[in-house]
Amino acid sequence: SPTPFGPEGQLADELHKPKAIQTEVKPSVRFNLRTSKDPEHEGCYLSLGHSQPLEDCGFNMTAKTFFIIHGWTMSGIFENWLHKLVSALHTREKDANVVVVDWLPLAHQLYTDAVNNTRVVGHSIARMLDWLQEKDDFSLGNVHLIGYSLGAHVAGYAGNFVKGTVGRITGLDPAGPMFEGADIHKRLSPDDADFVDVLHTYTRSFGLSIGIQMPVGHIDIYPNGGDFQPGCGLNDVLGSMAYGTITEVVKCEHERAVHLFVDSLVNQDKPSFAFQCTDSNRFKKGICLSCRKNRCNSIGYNAKKMRNKRNSKMYLKTRAGMPFRVYHYQMKIHVFSYKNMGEIEPTFYVTLYGTNADSQTLPLEIVERIEQNATNTFLVYTEEDLGDLLKIQLTWEGASQSWYNLWKELRSYLSQPHNPGRELNIRRIRVKSGETQRKLTFCAEDPENTSISPGRELWFRKCRDGWRMKNETSPTVELP
């Protein structure tokens, strides 16, 4: 079958490239108990049916037990994300058992062969868990399987095969090829654990989607829409290299799921929140920043168990690096009237001023056309905590819909040089903070002067808490 063009094309080639691997027999899966944060510490290999290594390695039967499951590999050596995740788990849960599932012999294969091996690896993990359950004090409820890429589906198989129910499975950008649209018993699914949470960071609706697009857990979180991750663009990744490959971009976006999870472990004081939404476009419009009825949740390790709904899709924006947290705001701008607008589509820019800090000038992303005499909703986010918002500066520019319209504008201007300027009339801006759920209304500083021309500034000051009229009360919202 033809491979797609673009970044995925080269990776598609990699997926099907034969590899000469000298393996006489297929060895069993190994379970390496990481007894130290030190990456050079060998750890201990657990052996099914042999209790002595459990004692020798200090396996804590009553503590949480994490199983980290890697994915497909082209190198046959553990990538550094695994080292970071082991270290972060040890830092956060000092008494926990951290077990690295080493299935490199079965993963260092053609991608298609590695996929076919996921079932047998899942079965091996399930057998290990069944054996551990025979021990006093060991509880399956304390088991958390963390699978990256192909490893997420291995975790699904393990959860499916084990006698009983695993406490939690976290899927870190579960693999897409050969799993997209598959039957629930042939991929990670909500049935595989008491709580299944998933981070999707490399999904594509065109070409090859390295990560699975469909929701496969109780909650499925799509940072930055689940596709283009900040800091992973060609300029970001290749710009800093003397020589670079497109594979670096793919790796950056796919692996971002792991780093978001690590961030949630080590930056507990800076939790990132995701918000339930039916799709990415609605989220980009800023209409999904509600925390009512479990509609928002922390991401990664701090996610709260939500089993009431299946396949709850959640979205958030992030920074380009750790800590990934940003502060989301919904902005409702009522455009009362256009004046001499022609075919010009306005682009808004806001600067937010708060008690802690001021934002940069932020563009308001237009998902749909700006409606006249209607309330337009936008999503904005800042990397720093601004504190309580005090005022907003608004500007706009006209972006022509086409070269033809631009020419029409120019011709109109040349024929009527004294044509009155284009103006928008905006009297107030309503703001809702995603993180605090607080609603505020900002009114034009000069109520008599609410028209704004391109490039000019309009200032808005906080005029009331909430969005309702003064005689109405606003219900309080409990954050999760």
């Epitope: 691997i21 050079e40 060998e42 050596i77 490199l104 800093s240 670079g244």
Partner: antibody
Framework: QVQLVQSGAEVKKPGASVKVSCKAS????????IHWVRQAPGQGLEWMGH????????NNNEKFKDRVTMTRDTSISTAYMELSRLRSDDTAVYYC?????????????WGQGTTVTVSS | DIQMTQSPSSLSASVGDRVTITCRAS??????LNWYQQKPGKAPKLLIS???KLHSGVPSRFSGSGSGTDFTLTISSLQPEDFATYYC?????????FGQGTKLEIK
């Protein structure tokens, strides 16, 4: 204590092949990866590739493409590196080195080196 | 491939001197930087891993620092046995690459 002992010096003609061995002791052979690094006379160090002795999976530096073959024999805790189609610029000291299970792990123990001279 | 550039290529110093060798990577290597010492006719020896972690048996006069793309190896008070060639190596991305080396000679 950890030790990596390599085979003796070799003199080869251009176009021939050379096979260098590296015997490990003092640790569990299958718990670490074995890497091959070479050093041309008066030059720096160049990574050639590695083998995971646990199952024999290898990964080579693209520079050596199909010329390098790495194998191992777990029964005698020995890793091998064969370089084919030798050229005069392959004259170098070839080292095996032990590395932990991560990319980031350092080469913590090295063999004494095997001098390979390619000359007609 | 990630390029590792060491400076200086060579330097002369006296016993008791404080010496600094720098290593620059062509991209961020997430602190996955190791330092080795090599004496003529011998195999390299690990000094420091993960930017600053001293390998067992290595004297405390050796120290490492840095982040992102710029790293430093410091010898606080040179001893006669420290005259050798020093190499940095990145462990962030395959293929693993080394600096070209810094030869430390007696003044």
């Amino acid at each position: 204590q950890v030790q990596l002992v390599q085979s003796g010096a070799e003199v080869k003609k251009p176009g021939a092949s050379v096979k260098v061995s590296c015997k490990a002791s003092g640790y569990t052979f299958t718990d670490n990866t074995i890497h091959w690094v070479r050093q041309a006379p008066g030059q720096g160090l160049e990574w050639m590739g590695h083998i995971n002795p646990y199952y024999g999976g290898t990964n080579n530096n693209e520079k050596f493409k199909d010329r390098v073959t790495m194998t191992r024999d777990t029964s005698i805790s020995t890793a091998y590196m064969e370089l084919s189609r030798l050229r005069s610029d392959d004259t170098a000291v070839y080292y095996c080195a032990r590395k932990g299970i991560y990319y980031s792990s350092p080469f913590d123990y090295w063999g004494q080196g095997t001098t390979v001279t390619v000359s007609s | 491939d990630i390029q590792m550039t060491q400076s200086p290529s060579s330097l002369s110093a006296s016993v008791g001197d404080r010496v600094t060798i720098t290593c620059r990577a062509s991209q961020d290597i997430n602190n996955y930087l190791n330092w080795y010492q090599q004496k003529p006719g011998k195999a390299p020896k690990l000094l420091i891993s993960y930017t600053s972690k001293l390998h067992s048996g290595v004297p405390s006069r050796f120290s490492g620092s840095g982040s992102g793309t710029d790293f430093t190896l410091t010898i606080s008070s040179l001893q006669p046995e420290d005259f050798a060639t020093y190499y940095c190596q990145q462990g962030n991305t395959l293929p693993f690459t080394f600096g070209q080396g810094t030869k430390l000679e007696i003044k």
